[in-house]
């Protein structure tokens, strides 16, 4: 049953002289393994004999017996599945059919297998793309359909006969479904290899010529062109004559349409190989070139700068930066159109030429208020001088100077006035938009500048405004001067440290905290009545008439003040005492009688002692000394001692009369 | 304790004549060496001494207001007086009386009025 065998290798292998062939095979006899092997070189069937005839190549027997002239076939396969040969060398006679007679314990079949042998290395074949175009990468691939083990070749790749710089990559196949060398390169080609040679190379191992194919490169590009100028360097006056001339060094396809362009821009009406431009003004001045197109695209010549030479025209100054700060730096740029460009410039400031200043830049490193106004330059070249242009304005911007606080009241100025001040000064860019005052205070500001201080304070002493554009400029601080009647007058003890007593020496000090001005005069009042005119009131011998309230005065050209009322307390002993009778010193007896002892001390009298004409204290010790009933024995002289913290003061001798009653009288 | 107090008119026209009163209590302005002074605040401004009369009677004034200030004593009242002539709005003040050992504008409550605002307008 033929349906049981499967074979899969390639129809037909190519190989040369001296070369080898590997055939790889595989199959699949369904019926169990392979018995019986042989390989014939063109076999045909006998049907007499019902058997293959032919030059048998290769034989496997069942005792697996190989005639030893087999050696150059090599059967490399197995009993089921593998079924590759190997021939090496091969030779040019083997060309032809190889079949294969397999056998098994009940199936036979004949596998035929074509064999190419040249005489000769056969060449590899070279593909190109359909087209190829300048600058875009293609592969180029060289196929031979030849590979074996036993036998290494390679594939090297020539341009003009040159080995080609790129890298290829060479791929070999011996699989059933192909067996191949393939060499791949990848190429830009430029317009330059249009027409040129591309070889692939056969080689052996050792790098020996074998074959090659090749090619004739077909690069389409767009036209290639070269510009010529009269003159050669293209430099020119206003009125001369140029002319240019485009030629095509190559072109595939052939071009179709020419043209001319200026910096980029088509000329119009200008489609020949010849451009001529007659009385050049410096408006033409640019770069030329000529384009020329073909299908792939257009082509672009090298650009010719046409340099139309002319004076310097009139110029413009650059500033960098106006508006520009004080101390800043400045740097200022004259333009001008000119070629060949300025050699030489004057540069002007108001109008007026700055001298040294001959460059095409001028740098002030610091730059000050009177750097400002207008800034104009001419430039010169070998052609002319040009013309000075409108200029540019630097405006110098700084902060205010020479700023002032000014008082405006007239001097002096006296505590509760209004006091107005104005910000002065001399020059401010931009212009002052706003002040500052220090100190702070809930002050007016009728008008900008102006600061008004109502019911001003003894104690303002300076005041500084600021005068501020974007930066703020301080003025040095202005006195006030307030003047003001004395303050916080008050009087002081000088002496004694403690309490005052009769008899003490005493100092009374006038004081103050300030005065404005300074010169001062004194005054001490006692109820109304002027003491005296120092700061001082002094007192040899304190009496208690001394005692009472104290104010002192101190005056200026501004006003007076007095002091609070001051007591002066003098402390003394009981002075003064005397013993007075109630009703009387004469009394009946039976009646009451009150002895009061009076006296003038400060402090008061804290304790009393009564004594009898006998000098004989009483145990009583209140102010009054009441006798109830008052006898005849009372009769007799009393005094009284008054004590306080300071001493004791007596009094003299007060007699007291008792006489009888009618009663005692009638009785006797 | 001393006290003194102005009155008279709030509201005066131009060129017209201003006259104050000062009543002095708690001591007599015949006696002692006291000075019995009349002085103003203008709106916005300092003190200003006008003019003083004397325990013994005699008058002193500012050299500022001389021409135009009279200053009298009715001791049975215990009174004295300001008359400012010819008023202009810039006498627009608040006017005190004070007292005063030399003559002053006197600073301290104790010894002068409350004092009394006078306006100037027509």
């Known amino acids: 049953d033929s349906s049981k065998w499967v074979f899969e290798h390639p129809e037909t292998l190519y190989a040369w002289e001296g070369a080898c062939v590997w055939i790889p095979c595989t199959y699949r006899a369904l019926d169990g393994d392979l018995e019986s092997f042989i390989l014939f070189h063109n076999p045909e069937y006998n049907k007499n004999t019902s058997k293959f005839d032919g030059t048998r190549l290769y034989e496997s027997t069942k005792d697996g017996k190989v005639p030893s002239e087999q050696k150059r076939v090599q059967f490399l396969g197995d009993k089921n599945k593998n079924c590759t040969l190997s021939i090496h060398p091969v030779h040019l006679n083997d060309s032809g059919q190889l079949g294969l007679r397999m056998e098994s314990k009940t199936e036979k079949w004949m596998e035929r297998i074509h064999l190419n042998v040249s005489e000769r290395p056969f060449p590899p074949h070279i593909q190109l793309p359909p087209e190829i175009q300048e600058s875009q990468e293609v592969t180029l691939t060289c196929l031979l359909n030849f590979s074996c083990y036993g036998y290494p070749i390679q594939l090297q790749w020539l341009l003009e006969g040159v080995p080609m710089r790129q890298a290829a990559v060479t791929s070999t196949s011996l699989t059933i479904k192909s067996v191949f060398t393939r060499s791949e390169l990848k190429f830009s080609p430029q317009w330059s290899h249009h027409g040129k040679i591309v070889t692939c190379q056969l080689q052996d191992a050792d790098g020996k010529f074998l074959s090659n194919d090749t090619v004739q490169l077909n690069v389409k590009h767009t036209p290639k062109l070269e510009i010529k100028v009269t003159p050669s360097d293209a430099i020119v006056r206003e009125g001369d004559s140029v002319t240019m001339t485009c030629e095509v060094s190559s072109s595939n396809p052939e071009y179709t349409t020419v043209s001319w362009l200026k910096d980029g821009t088509s000329l119009k009406k200008q489609n020949t190989f010849t451009l001529n431009l007659r009385e050049v003004t410096k408006d033409q001045s640019g770069k030329y070139c000529c384009q020329v197109s073909n299908d792939v695209g257009p082509g672009r010549s090298e650009e010719v700068f046409l340099q139309v030479q002319y004076a310097p025209e009139p110029s413009t100054v650059q500033i960098l930066h106006s508006p520009a700060v004080e101390g800043s730096q400045v740097e200022f740029l004259c333009m001008s159109l000119a070629n060949p460009l300025p050699t030489n410039y004057t540069w002007y400031h108001n109008g007026k030429e700055m001298q040294g200043r001959t460059e095409e830049k001028v740098h002030i490193p610091k730059i000050l208020p009177w750097h400002a106004g207008t800034y104009s330059c001419v430039a010169e070249n070998i052609l002319g001088t040009g013309q000075r242009g409108p200029g540019a304005e630097l405006d110098v911007q700084y902060p205010p100077k020479k700023v002032t606080t000014v008082i405006q009241n007239p001097m002096p100025i006296r505590e509760g006035d209004t006091v107005t001040l104005s910000c002065n000064y001399n020059s401010s860019n931009p212009s002052v938009t706003r002040y500052e005052w220090k100190p702070h205070g809930a002050w007016e500001e009728p008008s900008l500048g102006v600061l008004k201080i109502q019911n001003v304070g003894w104690d303002n002493t300076t005041i500084a405004c600021a005068a501020c554009n974007s930066w703020c400029s301080w003025a040095s601080p202005v006195a006030l001067n307030v003047q003001y009647a004395p303050r916080d007058v008050r009087v002081r003890k000088i002496k004694p440290l403690s309490e005052i007593h009769s008899g003490n020496s005493v100092s009374l000090q006038c004081d103050f905290s300030s005065s404005h001005p300074k010169e001062v005069q004194f005054f001490w009042e006692k109820n109304g009545r002027l003491l005296g005119k120092e700061s001082q009131l002094n007192f040899d011998s304190i009496s208690p008439e001394d005692a009472g309230s104290y104010s002192c005065w101190v005056n200026n050209s501004i006003g007076q003040t007095a002091s609070k009322a001051w007591t002066l307390e003098v402390l003394y002993a009981p002075r003064r005492l005397r013993v007075s009778m109630s009703p009387g010193d004469q009394v009946m007896e039976g009646k009451s009688a009150t002895l009061t002892c009076e006296s003038d001390a400060n402090p008061p009298v804290s304790h009393y002692t009564w004594f009898d004409w006998n000098n004989q204290s009483l145990p009583y010790h209140s102010q009054k000394l009441r006798l109830e009933p008052v006898k005849v024995q009372h009769s007799g002289a009393y005094w009284c001692q008054g004590t306080n913290s300071v001493g004791k003061g007596r009094s003299p001798l007060s007699t007291l009369t008792v006489y009888y009653s009618p009663e005692t009288i009638g009785r006797r | 304790q001393v006290q003194l107090q102005e009155s008279g008119p709030g509201l005066v026209k131009p060129s017209q004549t201003l006259s104050l009163t000062c009543t002095v209590s708690g001591a007599s302005i015949t006696t002692g060496e006291f000075y019995w002074n009349w002085f103003r605040q203008p709106p916005g401004k300092g003190l200003e001494w006008m003019g003083a009369i004397a325990a013994s009677g005699s008058t002193t004034y500012s050299p500022s207001f001389e021409s135009r200030t009279s200053i009298s004593r009715d001791t049975s009242k215990n009174q004295f007086s300001l008359k400012l002539s010819s008023v202009t709005a810039a006498d627009t003040a608040v006017y005190y009386c004070?007292?005063?050992?030399?003559?002053?504008?006197?600073?301290?409550?104790?010894?002068r009025g409350q004092g009394t605002l006078v306006t100037v307008s027509s």
């Open positions: 004070g007292r005063s050992f030399g003559v002053a504008a006197v600073t301290t409550g104790q010894n």
